[in-house]
């Protein structure tokens, strides 16, 4: 019967006793930077080419006995998970292996850097189809390694890495912390985060998604027909590398941004038990388990968006946090979140010719996060319209006044320290969906975009009684681009998007009286692109 991990990543319409995905990734080459491998294992023989690249440190200890099967164990298993004949994800993908880890599974930053440079040069000398680079390794944070990953990613290579097995914030490790890399955490057959002894999978905002990573059957270097189960974020990353290979084989022109958005979009949502993660990391960690798309074609019509969290600002009074989208993505909205509730909102601002989302801490606050909503919107022309504090009783308003521009997100930013605590709520007049409304003492920022066929609508959900969390979701066929709280609702910790749902968090209701001040309204802006839908219908 099909191993649990292959069943888990297979959409229901392809489920059978045998794992037979529609496309095997035959147009894609996957580079594996790992240990040496047993290339004559029948699971991978003829599918994996061992390059002459080797850059590894000496093994530790005078008593270390170099045994070939042990030296090859990690790499052989991962090669099998990616493209193995029987237990592989992308059975058609060809692979090339580079040895950057020694027989004890240890490597160096310099060895990995030289390996990445080797791939870049190979790509220049002999350009092939789409390339995926699998980095099933994790070390301490390295600015230079992250920069090398960025360079390769910007050259059109898809990099997939393990989040790390330290039961820690993945942002503290490299290459997991590199924004351009697709970082993968590990889950088990119960869709729970993988525990490895006293440690386990890493987590946090630097993780893009999770994938099967416990009790994964794959080629064993013990013998030519041997199989073994291994666990860890390396195995999880190998699944995503395989899925990426299959997606790229079906659509070779996909950019890294498009691929990442599709991986997120087609993942299983909200299946992971977040209680396993430290409390402060739960909101930052994506609740996504990787899966193959139900069809390898025809996803182009959708408006894809993802949520990007910034690093924590730190507690100083003037501290700010910045969230950025990838180069090919549009920032369609910006929100902020603070566990203490002390923040001064957020604003979208230009930085290096691109919009970023900046959140502001407040005096006495423990720090803030900026949350960017990053979307794929071809031929988009987006701008930010700002209204300064109005000082009028009706509050501050701003709308998209340019012809053909639609509202995709609202942000508000204020200079006063504790806006809204003693203010009555300001109600937004009905029938004006193309405008943002805020406190009279806040400056309001509207994200206004023009793109072929783009249409957006505002959806609200208000609860009169105090609630710790209020949500509003976009309907099927619409994508959440903006998420904010209606001004005047007090004690709001912030707002953020989780998949297609806008979440507004408030302070613990036990500390808040049940006055009208406790009312909370979540405001979602939901968009779709008729242009993309029509384009895909023409292609089919």
């Amino acid at each position: 019967s099909i191993p649990w991990n292959l069943e888990r990543i297979t959409p229901p319409r392809y489920r059978a006793d045998e794992y037979q995905p529609p496309d095997g990734g035959s147009l894609v080459e996957v580079y594996l930077l790992d240990t040496s491998i047993q290339s004559d294992h029948r699971e991978i023989e003829g599918r994996v080419m061992v390059t002459d690249f080797e850059n590894v440190p000496e093994e530790d200890g005078t008593r270390f006995h170099r045994q070939a099967s042990k030296c090859d164990s990690h790499g052989t298993h991962l090669a099998g998970v990616v493209s193995g004949r029987d237990a592989g994800v992308a059975k058609g993908a060809s692979m090339r292996s580079l040895r950057v880890l020694n027989c004890q599974g240890k490597g160096t930053v310099s060895g990995t850097l030289i390996g990445l440079e080797f791939i870049r040069k190979s790509q220049l000398v002999q350009p092939v189809g789409p390339l995926v680079v699998l980095l099933p390794l994790a070390g301490g944070y390295s600015r230079v390694l992250n920069a090398a990953c960025q360079r390769l990613a910007r050259a059109g290579v898809v990099l997939v890495t393990a989040a790390g097995n330290f039961r820690d914030d993945a942002c503290l490790y490299s290459p997991a912390s590199a924004p351009e890399v697709i970082t993968v955490g590990a889950t088990n057959a119960q869709d729970q985060p993988v525990t490895l002894g006293t440690l386990g999978t890493n987590f946090g905002r630097c993780v893009d998604l999770f994938a099967p990573g416990e009790d994964i059957i794959g080629a064993s270097s013990d013998c030519s027909t041997c199989f073994v189960s291994q666990s860890g974020t390396s195995q999880a990353a190998a699944h995503v590398a395989g899925i990426a290979a299959m997606m790229l084989s079906a659509e070779p022109e996909l950019t890294l941004a498009e691929l990442r958005q599709r991986l997120i979009h087609f993942s299983a949502k909200d299946v992971i038990n977040e209680a396993w993660f430290p409390e402060d990391q739960r909101v930052l960690t994506p609740n996504l388990v990787a899966a193959l798309p139900p069809s390898t074609h025809g996803a182009g019509w959708q408006l894809f968006c993802r949520t990007v969290w910034s690093a924590h600002s730190g507690p100083t009074r003037m501290a700010t946090a910045v969230a950025r989208c990838a180069p090919d993505e549009e920032l369609l909205s910006c929100s902020s979140f603070s566990r203490s509730g002390k923040r001064r909102g957020e604003r979208m601002e230009a930085q290096g010719g691109k919009l970023v989302c900046r959140a502001h801490n407040a005096f006495g606050g423990e720090g803030v996060y900026a949350i960017a909503r990053c979307c794929l919107l071809p031929q988009a022309n987006c701008s930010v319209h700002t209204a300064p504090p109005a000082e009028a009783s009706m509050g501050t308003r701003v709308h998209c006044h340019q012809q053909g521009h639609v509202l995709t997100g609202c942000s508000s930013h204020w200079e006063v320290e504790d806006l809204g605590t003693h203010k009555p709520p300001v109600l937004r007049p009905r029938g004006q969906p193309n405008q943002c409304v805020g406190h009279r003492e806040a400056s309001i920022h509207a994200s206004c975009c023009h793109a072929p066929g783009l249409e957006c609508k505002v959806k609200e959900h208000g609860i009169p009684a105090p609630q710790e969390q209020v949500t509003v979701a976009c309907e099927e066929g619409w994508t959440l681009t903006g998420c904010s709280a209606l001004p005047g609702t007090s004690h709001v910790l912030g707002a953020y998007a989780v998949d297609n749902t806008c979440v507004v968090r408030s302070r613990d209701v036990s500390t808040t009286g049940s006055t009208s001040e406790g009312a909370v309204t979540a405001v979602a802006i939901c968009c779709r692109s008729r242009h993309l839908a029509q384009a895909s219908q023409e292609l089919q």
């Epitope: 059978a16 006793d17 045998e18 794992y19 037979q20 029948r42 699971e43 023989e45 003829g46 599918r47 099967s69 164990s73 193995g84 004949r85 029987d86 237990a87 059975k91 058609g92 059957i217 064993s220 013990d222 013998c223 030519s224 027909t225 041997c226 199989f227 073994v228 189960s229």
Partner: antibody, heavy 119, light 113 residues
Framework: QVQLVQSGAEVKKPGESLKISCKGS????????ISWVRQMPGKGLEWMGL????????RYSPRFQGQVTISADKSISTAYLQWSSLKASDTAMYYC????????????WGQGTLVTVSS | DIVMTQSPDSLAVSLGERATINCRSS????????????LAWYQQKPGQPPKLLIY???TRESGVPDRFSGSGSGTDFTLTISSLQAEDVAVYYC?????????FGQGTKVEIK
């Protein structure tokens, strides 16, 4: 049900070519290996080689390398064993058998094809 | 190549009695990573193809009577028929499937005494 059905007995002269077949049914043919096993008259079993029909990967026993060719047509779920020039010593019963990657023992066998090479 | 040697070459046992066949491999077929012995036993009756009896040295194939059992580890293995029946008359082969080329023992012929 799961089965492997082999082509019928063959009588050939030395130097002639031959291709015998093994058709799989009742299972996903591309996801299992097919091995070929020789049994000379009154003798034991000898593994000749295998093929993975999913991508036509082959592996031969050194003693049969260059002597025979193993191939497959996954569109008709059939594996083949062929000789370009038969010898009298090729007279034997030939069996095909299937195995799976992480269950590499032969759980299903064909009924056998008797090849007789005589002048 | 891993050489598989069976003993005895032939064996005559009374009906209802125990039959024991030994198989020795020239190198270990036990692998530490999954703690499995890559050894199978097959039965071949006259005019029929071989039939799988035992795999992983001791796991009985479904449908095989429980009088057949396999044991051993590393390099030494045994197939036991606890109570020989008339239909058990056949040639029995051991096979290692861990290394290429896959190899069989020379076979042990079991007859009724």
């Amino acid at each position: 049900q799961v089965q492997l059905v082999q082509s019928g007995a063959e009588v050939k002269k030395p130097g002639e070519s031959l291709k015998i077949s093994c058709k799989g049914s009742g299972y996903s043919f591309t996801n299992y290996y097919i091995s070929w096993v020789r049994q000379m008259p009154g003798k034991g079993l000898e593994w000749m080689g295998l093929i993975y029909p999913g991508d036509s990967y082959t592996r031969y026993s050194p003693r049969f390398q260059g002597q025979v060719t193993i191939s497959a047509d996954k569109s008709i779920s059939t594996a083949y064993l062929q000789w370009s020039s038969l010898k009298a010593s090729d007279t034997a019963m030939y069996y095909c058998a299937r195995d799976h990657g992480y269950k590499p023992y032969s759980d299903i066998w064909g009924q056998g094809t008797l090849v007789t090479v005589s002048s | 190549d891993i050489v598989m040697t069976q003993s005895p070459d032939s064996l005559a046992v009374s009906l209802g009695e125990r039959a024991t066949i030994n198989c020795r491999s020239s190198q270990s077929v036990l692998y530490s990573s999954n703690n499995k012995n890559y050894l199978a036993w097959y039965q071949q009756k006259p005019g029929q193809p071989p039939k799988l009896l035992i795999y992983w040295a001791s796991t009985r194939e479904s449908g095989v009577p429980d009088r057949f059992s396999g044991s051993g580890s590393g390099t030494d293995f045994t197939l036991t028929i606890s109570s020989l029946q008339a239909e058990d008359v056949a040639v029995y082969y051991c096979q290692q499937y861990s290394s290429f080329p896959i190899t069989f023992g020379q076979g042990t012929k079991v007859e009724i005494k």
